[in-house]
């Protein structure tokens, strides 16, 4: 029959070429002279050449070495015709399969892998995925059939077998316990693949797998007793540097330190933190320490990590005793800001008040005391018993000096001690008004008109404090109510002037006595200014000059 | 201070052998991964070999198969086995330190060098 | 094996001026999970063996004078002097040390103008 089954040819063959691989025949040969032919790629079209047919046998030859990799099948066409070139046959399908010879090594993806573990993981863990290829035939043949390995370890530590690999998908595990990234933080591994699944030709790469840091290891205080010595009263004051060593990766929060007062600070007089470069704990003091009130703190500190550890770890305690330093105290005025009142205009050397400090020191010092700023001068004090008196006259009314009636010392306290200390006290004295100022009328100077005069309205001030101000009487002296008119308005603390008969154009001397309501009197002399006018004025009009 | 001092080079034979050394001071010897290199007369610098801490090694394709890598951490010495030799490798060959003992630590990179040795492989 | 590729062959500089040399991989050198590129650069004078000048791309070697410095990523690369010296007339090389075998750029010449 005109049929060939697929024909199978090695790669790489030896020859010698041409070789004969396979006879096309045709059974119309018995009647006619037959020629055969072939098409395809291969043939007559691209590779061509690699294969002929004897046109007279009909063998198919093969005319150089095939390589698989390259083309792994051929699908040609046999053709036969008669000696005048009609056909005889139908195109014959011949296939001609190239099978594989083991002739490339397998190759990894990359010349060096890397990948990573955390420290402490079971085994088991997967680590990373290795990859090689081999161009050759991996479906029937074994030949690009890869199998991994690893060649060697480095370092041996713990053992030599801390790893293995998958040998089909190339999938490196953790085979052993004891990776510690603290004794090894990485490992090298040679690793193999052979074709022929395991049986062929070996190429190798490196595979870099980094041990990475778990919070295994618990910071420890190095040393773990300290002794310090702090001034009593001084806040911030750095106490101590505390020292911790941790195994674990530097910076990283397995690391990092965290602090914690555990015990023997009761009045939470202490604050500690993290320094963020030496990984040491400040101590500070967040309040004063008192000498006085206690001279020596235990304090008991914890420290663990930024991290939680992964395993149960001992916590390391650090013990801190804190000699407090005795300080020459200031003198504390007792209270630090003292209210009195007292009456304005007192005479001079009255008493007004004793003002003194206590000394929070414990043995019995010397205070002295002193005026450190009294604005208007008005008081002394006694250097010894702190007896401040009046030296000047007290004057609520003065603007420069009081303010909302009270009048502001201050008072200093120095005790002996070596240096010698200072405190203040603030001494607000209230000032009680007394009815020392009379009612003055604002303005003082008016202008009026003298025909149909407007009345003047004056605005009455009294510096005292009620009761000692309206309601107001207004009462005109030195014949001057012939002239004018004066009445008090209660309802807004004005006197209204009135002129009452015609004066000629000129200034006047007007004679107002004003009287508040504890009748304490203020004589006051307004100018008045008459026009030749009628109504309202501001300025006299020019005289008028004829023509 | 660091010191490596290469010794061992000279004239042989093509497919003759030749044993390199070098004597390293100033440093933990036995802590760091040592590199061969080699310069061929007026041209680059060809990385050879590398030796591990615990004796591990890789090698360059073009010398792999032909020369062998050692040390010995009690002479702090590192050697380079060269067998089969041929004319083009003819070169001064260095040994240098990796700056680094791990491989995220940057021991690719190589801090200290030797003087070099001169190979001439010649009939 | 990666390629290391460097430009120019040869360059020549005034003193005082800033001299820039290239290196380009043929596969990239940065390292994604501790954003790392293995690469360095060293200085060759003649009859001298090489003296490392960079690592990590941009670190730069103690001792080495702040003239000199390195940088870029992934497959592209840069040695940059600042304010070229004469001491600095040398051969400077890239090299990889991403993946075994190490290889090394063929070198740049610098000289003064």
């Known amino acids: 029959d005109w049929v060939v089954a697929p024909i199978s040819v090695p790669e790489n063959g030896k020859g010698p070429f041409p070789q004969r691989l396979n006879q096309l025949k045709s059974n119309k040969d018995r009647d006619t002279k037959i020629f055969y032919s072939i098409t395809g790629p291969g043939a007559d079209s691209p590779p061509e050449g690699v294969f002929a047919v004897e046109k007279e046998t009909g063998w198919l030859l093969l005319n150089k070495p095939l390589d698989r990799e390259e083309i792994a099948k051929y699908e040609l066409f046999g053709h036969a015709v008669s000696e005048n070139g009609a056909s005889v046959e139908d195109p014959m399908n011949i296939s001609i399969i190239v099978t594989d010879q083991n002739d490339h090594k397998p190759k990894f993806t990359q010349d060096t892998f890397r990948g990573s573990v955390l420290e402490g993981v079971l085994p088991g863990t997967s680590v990373m995925q290795v990859t090689a290829t081999d161009e050759d035939d991996a479906i029937h043949t074994y030949n690009g059939v890869v199998a991994y390995s690893i060649h060697s370890q480095e370092p041996k530590d713990p053992h030599d077998l801390m790893f293995t690999i998958h040998r089909s998908t190339g999938t490196i595990s953790v085979i052993s316990s004891g990776l510690d990234r603290e004794k090894v933080p990485e490992y090298t591994l040679t690793i193999q693949a052979t074709d022929m699944d395991g049986d062929g030709s070996t190429t190798t790469a490196v595979a870099v797998v980094e041990i990475l840091d778990a919070n295994d290891n618990a910071p420890v205080f190095d040393p773990q007793k300290y002794e310090s010595h702090v001034p009593e009263n001084a806040v911030g004051h750095e106490v101590q540097r505390l020292t911790v060593t941790d195994l674990d990766a530097p910076n990283s929060p397995a690391w990092r330190a965290t602090y914690l007062i555990v015990g023997g600070d009761d009045g939470d007089h202490f604050t500690i933190a993290t320094h963020p470069e030496s990984n040491q704990g400040i101590l500070t003091t967040r309040k004063g320490l008192d000498f006085e009130a206690k001279n020596q703190h235990t304090l008991y500190v914890e420290v663990t990590n930024e991290a939680p550890f992964v395993l149960k770890l001992p916590t390391s305690t650090a013990t801190i005793v804190v000699h407090v330093e005795d300080v020459n105290e200031a003198p504390v005025f007792v209270p630090p800001s003292k209210v009195v009142e007292v009456q304005e205009g007192i005479p001079t050397g009255e008493a007004v008040c004793v003002y003194t400090a206590k000394d929070p020191d414990k043995e019995n010092q010397k205070i002295s005391y002193r005026i450190l700023r009294d604005p208007a001068g008005w008081l002394a004090m006694d250097p010894d018993s702190g007896q401040v008196t009046v030296a000047g006259t007290l004057d609520r009314e003065d603007e420069r000096f009081v303010r909302n009636n009270i009048y502001e010392v201050m008072v200093l306290a120095v005790d002996n001690g070596s240096p010698p200390t200072t405190g203040t006290g603030t001494l607000l004295l209230t000032l009680i008004d007394v009815n020392d100022h009379g009612p003055v009328p604002e303005p003082r100077e008016i202008t009026i008109c003298n025909q149909s005069p407007e009345s003047q309205v004056l605005n009455i001030t009294d510096k005292d404090l009620s009761p000692h101000t309206s309601p107001f009487q207004a009462q005109l002296t030195d014949d001057s109510d012939i002239y004018w008119m004066a009445e008090v308005n209660e309802k807004d603390d004005t006197v209204v002037l009135s002129l009452k008969k015609f004066l000629k154009q000129d200034t006047y001397d007007v004679h107002l006595s004003l009287s508040d309501h504890g009748n304490k009197e203020q004589l006051t002399v307004i100018r008045a200014t008459v026009c030749d006018c009628h109504g309202h004025v501001e300025k006299c009009p020019d005289p008028w000059k004829g023509g | 201070e660091v010191q490596l001092l290469e010794s061992g080079g000279g004239l042989v034979q093509p497919g003759g052998s030749l044993r390199l050394s070098c004597a390293a001071s100033g440093f933990s010897f036995s802590s760091y991964p040592i590199n061969w290199v080699r310069q061929a007369p007026g041209k680059g610098l060809e990385w050879l070999s590398v030796i591990w801490t615990g004796g591990g090694t890789n090698y360059a394709s073009s010398v792999k198969g032909r020369f062998t890598i050692s040390r010995d951490n009690s002479k702090n010495t590192l050697y380079l086995q060269m067998n089969s030799l041929r004319a083009e490798d003819t070169a001064v060959y260095y040994c240098?330190?990796?700056?680094?003992?791990?491989?995220?630590?940057?021991?690719?990179?190589?801090?200290?060098w030797g003087q070099g040795t001169l190979v001439t492989v010649s009939s | 094996d990666i390629v290391m590729t460097q430009s120019p062959d040869s360059l020549a500089v005034s003193l005082g001026e800033r001299a820039t040399i290239n290196c380009k991989s043929s596969?990239?050198?940065?390292?994604?999970?501790?954003?790392?590129?293995?690469l360095a650069w060293y200085q060759q004078k003649p009859g001298q063996p090489p003296k490392l000048l960079i690592y990590w791309a941009s670190t730069r070697e103690s001792g080495v004078p702040d003239r000199f410095s390195g940088s870029g990523s992934g497959t592209d690369f840069t040695l940059t002097i600042s304010s070229v010296q004469a001491e600095d007339v040398a051969v400077y090389y890239c090299q990889q040390y991403y993946s075994y075998p190490y290889t090394f750029g063929q070198g740049t010449k610098l000289e003064i103008k």
């Open positions: 240098a330190k990796s700056r680094g003992v791990y491989d995220f630590d940057g021991r690719g990179a190589m801090d200290y």
């Open positions: 596969q990239s050198l940065l390292y994604s999970s501790n954003q790392k590129n293995y």
